[in-house]
């Protein structure tokens, strides 16, 4: 019989008492085969973290700073359940740490040196740890003691709870630095008042502070937020302009064998029976013998943290950077305007080979990081392990939802001004063999399908979006008799036609021979009835242009396109017979790397781009023998985006809407995780 006990860790007598009450009340409402609670008492949160890691306890609820500690080796814990605040309809699981300034003050984030600062309190998250952690490498050396470095960075501050004797500058704006509401500039409202009164130039608070203190929009409009990219935004745009997004209070468990499903089952049932306004006898979010025992008193319920989300992703790049800077205190030798090498994310060993070749030719400008799937690469870029990669539009959408930004677009047509003119896009098509003359768009049911990969534009999002509109369900594996759609569940009929061996079967990378445009076309040639690819795929792989044994004798005339009106046309008539226009592939990165990725890639394409004529004796960035490694092989240049510099603007309203509609069919664990952070 599986053990269905969750051992909750308590850190005080009062918590232990509430835990026992929790245990007893759960027993009274949950059947004997359901989850149960046991209580383990430890002296501190850090002891609880160690106990969970050692399998002496299973769960504890932690503030963000402790979630970071819990994630560090050797603890390796992960977030499994989040408390939420506000309403069930609009649950808030995160708050945003922001830097608020007066509208007319005219400086940016990188110009804070010498300004006057207002903090909620020394050592507090939004008011101190996050802003000071992010500014850490700009502080004057020596950076220890930290208070002295901060005092020397700003021209005056109010940092309640600081030592006014040792660091008088930190108390210059609020004499005494009192550590309670007796100090008018203490806490969130106090720090904002410090700004409002004109004592300080910037207040480090949370996003809700300004709304709680200024009910009137006209008053709020006198203030702005400083963004990390050295711009400003209105105060209601905090989701796009903050220092960090911070989880409020989170249940953590072991990463391996951590009982996360059981913990969720327990807490979900607990909130049903003992959540807000549920029971008089026992209340989960109430602490008669103290404050915030086991859970925050202000919590309204729990949400399950998506399983794909580890602590780094949950806490977010900015928060992890800030806390790591504060804890480890390491900075580059001297801050320079030089760009660090761009860490390119390569998919599987084929891309890694090409990336290694690029790296040595780039003389240190490019470094390589490997991952097995596109989603793993996106996650690595999010958390700073990698910096950039070029993505199909479907993944630009996921990357955008995960906070990444497009920085350059692949262009496929030769033009005089290639780098300055991003193209409208390419065509997604459905290709069939000419010999299968009865096949049309309207009778694909039961046929064998070939897809570039799940989640990609021409191979999946466009054809499956159109199909979904017709069949109104997501069971595409039942619509087609079998197929190859790399990235599908291994037991799905949409992996049946794939050719990868062993563990590589149906993998969404080049180890699966039917992956990508060329792979999907090969699947059609060898096994399938229809391939969903781009309009250039057939000409690029016929007429001897692809020398691989399977392709060298193919003739373009032996293939036709399916049109949406039920007719068929020759391959060259793609402009009048396609499924939709697809946005070109684009390079994505984190916002903080945008300028450097742009600069280095433009240098790299000038060295190794289409201007290189002999690719047998020189490195060519946009060539890989029809395998589309790192970039599409038909890329002519990487083009500036001008104002299309967000994923929505880049992909266009129509495509974003189409992918949004298909979201209900999504199997992307990363998309689920990212929409948890930003619904």
């Amino acid at each position: 019989v599986p053990d269905k006990t969750v051992r909750w860790c308590a850190v005080s007598e009062h918590e232990a008492t509430k835990c026992q009450s929790f245990r007893d009340h759960m027993k009274s409402v949950i059947p004997s085969d359901g989850p149960s609670v046991a209580c383990v008492k430890k002296a501190s949160y850090l002891d609880c973290i160690r106990a969970i890691a050692a399998n002496e306890a299973d769960a504890v609820t932690l503030d963000a700073g402790l979630v970071y500690d819990a994630y560090l080796a050797p603890n390796n814990l992960k977030p499994v359940v989040a408390e939420f605040y506000g309403s069930k309809e609009d649950p808030q699981t995160f708050y945003y740490a922001v830097a608020v300034v007066k509208k007319d003050s005219g400086f940016q984030m990188n110009q804070l040196r010498g300004k006057k600062s207002c903090h909620t309190g020394l050592g507090r998250s939004a008011g101190w740890n996050i802003p000071i952690g992010l500014l850490y490498c700009d502080l004057p050396e020596p950076r220890k003691p930290l208070e002295k470095a901060v005092a020397n960075f700003f021209s005056g501050s109010c940092a309640p709870c600081a030592d006014g004797t040792d660091f008088p500058q930190l108390c210059q704006l609020c004499p005494g630095c009192g550590c309670s509401t007796l100090n008018q500039y203490f806490g969130y409202s106090g720090a904002f008042k410090c700004l409002k009164d004109g004592a300080g130039d910037v207040a480090f608070v949370k996003h809700s502070t300004i709304f709680e203190n200024l009910a009137n929009k006209a008053d709020r409009d006198q203030y702005e937020l400083l963004c990390l990219d050295n711009t400003r935004k209105p105060v209601d745009e905090y989701k796009d302009c903050h220092l960090a997004q911070v989880p409020s209070h989170t249940v953590v468990a072991r990463s391996m064998g951590g009982k996360e499903d059981l913990i969720w089952e327990l807490l979900n049932q607990a909130q049903e029976h003992f959540g807000k306004d549920k029971s008089k006898e026992f209340q989960l979010f109430s602490s008669p013998h103290g404050k915030d025992l086991l859970f925050k008193d202000s919590a309204h319920g729990f949400l399950k943290v998506p399983p794909r989300m580890d602590a780094k992703m949950y806490l977010g790049y900015e928060y992890v950077t800030a806390i790591r800077n504060l804890r480890e205190g390491t900075c580059p030798e001297a801050p320079t305007d030089e760009c660090k090498p761009v860490k390119w994310c390569a998919l599987s060993h084929h891309e890694r080979l090409k990336c290694d070749e690029w790296s040595v030719n780039s003389v240190g400008k490019i470094e390589c990081v490997s991952a097995e799937t596109t989603e793993d690469c996106i996650a690595k870029i999010m958390n700073g392990e990698a910096d950039a990669m070029s993505l199909d539009g479907g993944f630009v959408y996921i990357a955008g939802k995960c906070g990444l930004v497009p920085v350059l677009a692949e262009n496929y047509n030769k033009s005089d001004n290639c780098e300055d003119t991003p193209e409208a896009g390419y065509f997604a098509i459905a290709v069939v063999k000419k010999s299968a003359s009865d096949l049309t768009w309207d009778n694909l049911k039961g046929k064998k399908s070939c897809h570039t990969a799940v989640g990609r534009t021409a191979g999946w999002n466009i054809p499956m979006g159109l199909l979904y509109n017709k069949i109104n369900h997501c069971r595409f594996d039942e619509f087609f008799s079998e197929g190859c759609a790399p990235g599908s569940k291994k037991d799905s009929s949409l992996c049946k036609l794939c050719m990868g061996s062993g563990l590589n079967l149906c993998e969404p990378n080049n180890k699966e021979g039917y992956y990508g445009y060329t792979g999907a076309f090969r699947c059609l040639v060898e096994k399938g009835d229809v391939a969903f690819v781009k309009h250039q795929t057939v000409p690029q792989n016929t007429g001897g242009k692809n020398p691989d044994p399977w392709a060298k004798n193919l003739n373009e005339k032996d293939y036709e396109l399916l049109c949406l009106d039920g007719t068929r046309k020759p391959v060259e008539e793609y402009a009048n017979c396609h499924l939709a226009r697809a946005p070109n592939h684009a390079v994505v990165t984190r916002k903080d790397k945008e300028a450097c990725v742009h600069k280095i890639l433009r240098q790299q394409q000038h060295l190794f781009g289409s201007n290189v004529t002999d690719c047998s004796g020189n490195f060519c960035l946009f060539r890989s023998e029809t395998k589309d490694l790192l970039f599409r092989d038909d890329t002519v240049c990487l083009a500036k985006l001008h104002d299309r510099n967000t994923y929505e603007k880049y992909l266009g309203e129509e495509y974003v809407k189409a992918v949004g509609n298909l979201r209900k069919c999504s199997t992307s664990s990363l998309l689920e995780a990212c929409t948890f952070r930003r619904p």
Epitope: L353, K354, E357, V360, N361, S616, G617, F619, E625
Partner: nanobody, 117 residues
Framework: QVQLVESGGGLVQPGGSLRLSCAAS????????MGWYRQRPGKQRELVAA???????NYADSVKGRFSISRDNAKNTMYLQMNSLKPEDTAVYYC???????????WGQGTQVTVSS
């Protein structure tokens, strides 16, 4: 397309040295980039070092300061000088000229290096 043959591997004690050679069947003068990879038991093949025609080099962090890559275009040979060898350097070492056959996983036999006392 030139064929490449690796040699020079063997059994060596920790702290010892070896020099691997990669001989090409034709001219390597026109080959821009060449590299050494290794595959440890149960692991993916990984870059050890690479060198361009112009002499730019790149090393894996784990071998920096201990290994040195060079090429002699006149002798159509590339070398990997391996010093201060460690047990974790035990692997089959392969050379590559980054031509299209490597995208087809068409690697040579490699040369076995074993570091053990």
């Amino acid at each position: 397309q030139v064929q490449l043959v690796e040699s020079g591997g063997g059994l060596v004690q920790p702290g010892g040295s070896l020099r691997l050679s990669c001989a090409a069947s034709g001219s390597i003068f026109s080959i821009n980039t060449m590299g050494w990879y290794r595959q440890r038991p149960g692991k993916q093949r990984e870059l050890v070092a690479a060198i361009t025609r112009g002499g730019n080099t790149n090393y894996a962090d784990s071998v920096k300061g201990r290994f040195s890559i060079s090429r002699d275009n006149a002798k159509n040979t590339m070398y990997l000088q391996m010093n201060s060898l460690k047990p974790e350097d035990t692997a089959v070492y392969y050379c590559t000229d980054y031509s299209r056959r490597y995208y087809q996983d068409d690697w040579g036999q490699g040369t076995q290096v074993t570091v053990s006392s």
